[in-house]
């Protein structure tokens, strides 16, 4: 095959090699860019910057090599459009630094930076950490800082991500209140900070105020939906990013729902309870307190992380006719109480007969109003009561 005369030539089914001296000063308009998985660039001394727009349209790119070229600067968001990138070789360029943001969000198996005049500073603390943790093949490169010695020996005591403290109201918050949160940011070289409020939706009206180093957030007219929702303050410097999440507890009264008993392995009377603080629960059976046991007990489902409502079952492992009756769930917290009742019939009473049946005896009733909550049978105290055991 005749040699390829272009600046960039196909290599394999989805690769491109650009090795002709000085032919490129940017990566715009590469042929077949959208299908490329491998891009090899060498000897491009005019290629000095790598920015977001350079790699737009290279969504399938997995291997990127830019070596022995003039690369001085890689933008923090340069690889935003190449999320599949797993091998990045930028060796023998003119890079003095590389932001932690550049590689954030990528799953790099290999990162090669040898042969660059790196400048040791806190901005390379992340790379030093990669070296310490054996990531991306970095330790094998024995990276040096220009005129400063090995990267591994760079002092890092002062290289910390920002420190965040979020102040939340310690008094009880009620539905309809306004809540002021403040995020204090400390640290060197602060670059950006803000709030992440994606979980809040309709939980409150949001107003942001202030800037570094003290960010304010007012949550106006809060609803009970705000409970269990994360309000997150974040800040970044050249070392990395810090986030702190808090939750605001909005008090509201207990509520309860009961549903028809269902057979699930044994039996379950499903319920839902809500309230902040979490309500205490009590069951009644036919108006008397039901003492829970290993065969009749409350079992909660795994709670959803972002809501206060709890779902569960009153488990009845072996209910018979003596367990038929009215079940009431009482829920209470300091802001109110609620109850719900449901009739449950698990099994016909084998001692009950159709009154038209010609059987000349009366049958002793079952007292389901046991205060202990344990199934109890009492014999009828009338003189003509006859007990019949049905086997």
């Amino acid at each position: 095959a005749a040699p390829c005369p272009d600046a960039c030539c196909p290599h394999g089914s989805s690769g491109l090699r650009c090795t002709r001296d000085g032919a490129l000063d940017s990566l715009h308009h590469l042929p077949g860019a959208e299908n490329l998985t491998e891009l090899y660039i060498e000897n491009q001394q005019h290629l000095q910057h790598l920015e977001l727009r350079d790699l737009r349209g290279l969504g399938e790119l997995r291997n990127l090599t830019i070596v022995k070229s003039g690369l001085r600067f890689v933008a923090p968001d340069a690889f935003h459009f190449t999320p599949r990138l797993s091998r990045l070789n930028l060796s023998f360029n003119a890079l003095e630094s590389l932001s932690w943001k550049t590689v954030q969000g990528l799953s790099l198996q290999e990162l090669v930076l040898s042969g660059n005049p790196l400048h040791c500073s806190c901005a390379l603390r992340w790379l030093q950490r990669w070296e310490e943790e054996g990531l991306g093949g970095v330790p094998e490169q024995k990276l040096q800082c220009h005129g400063q010695g090995p990267l591994a020996h760079m002092p890092n005591a002062s290289c910390g991500v920002p420190t965040l403290k979020v102040q939340v109201p310690n008094a009880s918050v009620d539905v309809g209140d306004d809540v002021l949160l403040r995020c204090q940011v400390e640290g060197r070289g602060l670059e950006q900070a803000g709030w992440i409020l994606t979980e809040l939706e309709q939980s409150a009206t949001v107003m942001k105020s202030g800037g570094l180093p003290s960010l304010g957030l007012t949550l106006a007219n809060v609803t009970s939906d705000l409970n269990r929702k994360n309000v997150t303050c974040w800040a970044e410097n050249d070392v990395g990013r810090a986030e702190v999440s808090v939750q605001v507890n909005v008090s509201f009264p207990a509520s309860v729902q009961l549903h028809t008993a269902v057979e699930m392995h044994h039996w379950c009377i499903p319920f839902s309870v809500d309230g902040q603080p979490a309500p205490s629960l009590r069951w009644l059976f036919n108006g008397s307190v039901l003492n829970e046991t290993s065969f009749i007990f409350t079992e909660f489902l795994e709670p959803a992380a972002n809501e206060t409502v709890r779902h569960g079952c009153l488990r009845l492992n072996q209910p018979t006719h003596v367990n038929n009756g009215n079940y009431t769930l009482l829920a209470a917290n300091p802001f109110g109480q609620a109850s719900a009742s449901i009739m449950a019939a698990f099994m016909d009473n084998p001692f009950e007969f159709n009154p038209e049946d010609p059987i000349p005896v009366s049958f002793s009733p079952v007292d389901t109003n046991s205060t202990s909550g344990d199934p109890v049978e009492k014999k009828d105290e009338t003189p003509f009561g006859v007990s019949v055991a049905v086997g």
Epitope: E292, F297, T298
Partner: antibody, heavy 117, light 106 residues
């Protein structure tokens, strides 16, 4: 697999207390009730009580109510049964057993407690 | 308390025999459960909810009954079946066991 491993044999004097442990593994400790059952030499099985780690709920057999205390340490998935004011007729093998929807599915290997002066 | 009375208290039988153990409750219980215990070992669940076989239990074991009268049947005794059998109720506190039936080789 599910395992209930009990503490070793104990010899106690009358009037003393004994605390038997039952370490669980192979299942979610908080989802199951733990029962304690004892068996005197050559005798039948006697239920002492039950505890639900999830809510700390306890039910005791009236016979032992003033002498027995059942507790759990959720962090190490372990249940405990303490019996106080021991008498010679408390000499028995003490078992733990777990239940959720069915009774006493799995049992510990037993702990022999001997009460002797 | 619900008293459970097993009969017989002891029983001699031969390999291949059909054996029935009964358990009578002092008041109606919803279900009965059966355990097998061998000397020096913890009890092992045999039958639960009156008639359900626990995992790994051979089908020669069966249970039946309702109300106050329950039965454990072994259709054809095997050498490993010689042990003590207990019934248990799980319907009211305190949970109670029968006094046991010792099954011996004739």
């Amino acid at each position: 697999q599910v395992q209930l491993v009990q503490s070793g044999a104990e010899v106690k004097k009358p009037g003393a207390s004994v605390k038997v442990s039952c370490k669980s593994s192979g299942y979610t400790f908080t989802n199951y009730w733990m029962h304690w059952v004892r068996q005197a030499p050559g005798q039948g099985l006697e239920w002492m009580g039950e505890i639900y780690p999830n809510q700390g709920r306890v039910n005791y057999n009236e016979k032992f109510k003033n002498r027995v205390t059942m507790t759990v340490d959720i962090s190490i998935s372990t249940a405990y049964m303490e019996l106080s004011r021991l008498r010679s007729d408390d000499t028995a093998v003490y078992y733990c057993a777990r239940s959720r929807y069915d009774p006493m599915e799995d049992w510990g290997q037993g702990t022999t407690v001997t009460v002797s002066s | 308390d619900v008293q459970l009375t097993q009969s017989p208290s002891s029983l001699s039988a031969s390999v291949g025999d059909r054996v029935t153990i009964t358990c009578s409750a002092s008041s109606s219980v919803g279900y009965m459960h059966w355990y097998q215990q061998k000397p020096g070992k913890a009890p092992k669940r045999l039958i639960y909810d009156t008639s359900k076989l626990a995992s790994g239990v051979p089908s020669r074991f069966s249970g039946s009954g309702s109300g106050t009268d329950y039965t454990l049947t072994i259709s054809s005794l095997q050498p490993e079946d010689f042990a003590t059998y207990f019934c248990q109720q799980w319907s009211s506190i305190p949970l109670t066991f029968g006094q046991g039936t010792r099954l011996e080789i004739k």
